[in-house]
Amino acid sequence: NKILVKQSPMLVAYDNAVNLSCKYSYNLFSREFRASLHKGLDSAVEVCVVYGNYSQQLQVYSKTGFNCDGKLGNESVTFYLQNLYVNQTDIYFCKIEVMYPPPYLDNEKSNGTIIHVKGKHLCPSPLFPGPSKP
């Protein structure tokens, strides 16, 4: 039995930040679980992890180069990514594992979310201001 995951197909980070919501066909209340966010088509780079259990506060881990926070819903984990760079534009996959109570469960691979990080286009100040009017 596998948990199904729903993600938005695409998100645009205009201000170098984005909320990626991973919605599960499973209620995480009173469960020990590990939710993670993976970068790249092959999911090779795990960038954020949210660990939760029934007795502790939610724990969030960010890989170096990523600024990540996590929020738990009954059937979702939302990853809040900040300070994203244009070169971090990629496809991101949500993964979930539930360890307790048994049985161990994980998810069917989701379709992923393309996060498109838009660079900040600041209007450059003119190098040579025009002649000043009298």
Epitope: E32, R34, Q59, Y61, K63, M99
Partner: nanobody, 124 residues
Framework: EVQLVESGGGEVQPGGSLRLSCAAS????????MGWFRQAPGKEREFVAA????????DYAESVKDRFTISRDNAKNTVYLQMSSLRAEDTAIYYC?????????????????WGQGTLVTVKP
């Protein structure tokens, strides 16, 4: 809950070698990392080396690169620290740590569980 038990510490002469082991037990997920930190008397606990479950990510403190090697046996849930060319400044209590992060984290705060520590003494 995760339990960690270290072994392998002892006294060795400068230039000598030791291998530390750390066995983990408890509920494990498909990816996590384990690391070694050390604490010399009167000093902060500092990062030494770490490796993730998939063994595709390892990291070392600058001071131990080319002298220490971290490895793991996933079948035994055990991480090893092979220490060679030991110096007096490597004398410390070595602690094994466990983190739910899936990468070789050097951040002490990322580690949720710690072993009891094993003493390594390097002296002539």
């Amino acid at each position: 809950e995760v339990q960690l038990v270290e072994s392998g510490g002892g006294e060795v002469q400068p230039g000598g070698s030791l291998r530390l082991s750390c066995a983990a037990s408890g509920r494990m997920f498909s990816n996590y990392a384990m690391g070694w930190f050390r604490q010399a008397p009167g000093k902060e606990r500092e990062f030494v080396a770490a490796i993730n479950y998939r063994r595709d990510d390892a990291d070392y403190a600058e001071s131990v690169k080319d002298r220490f090697t971290i490895s793991r046996d996933n079948a035994k849930n055990t991480v090893y620290l092979q220490m060679s060319s030991l110096r007096a400044e490597d004398t410390a209590i070595y602690y094994c740590g466990f983190t739910y992060a899936g990468w070789a984290s050097s951040r002490r705060d990322d580690y949720n569980y710690w072993g009891q520590g094993t003493l390594v003494t390097v002296k002539p």
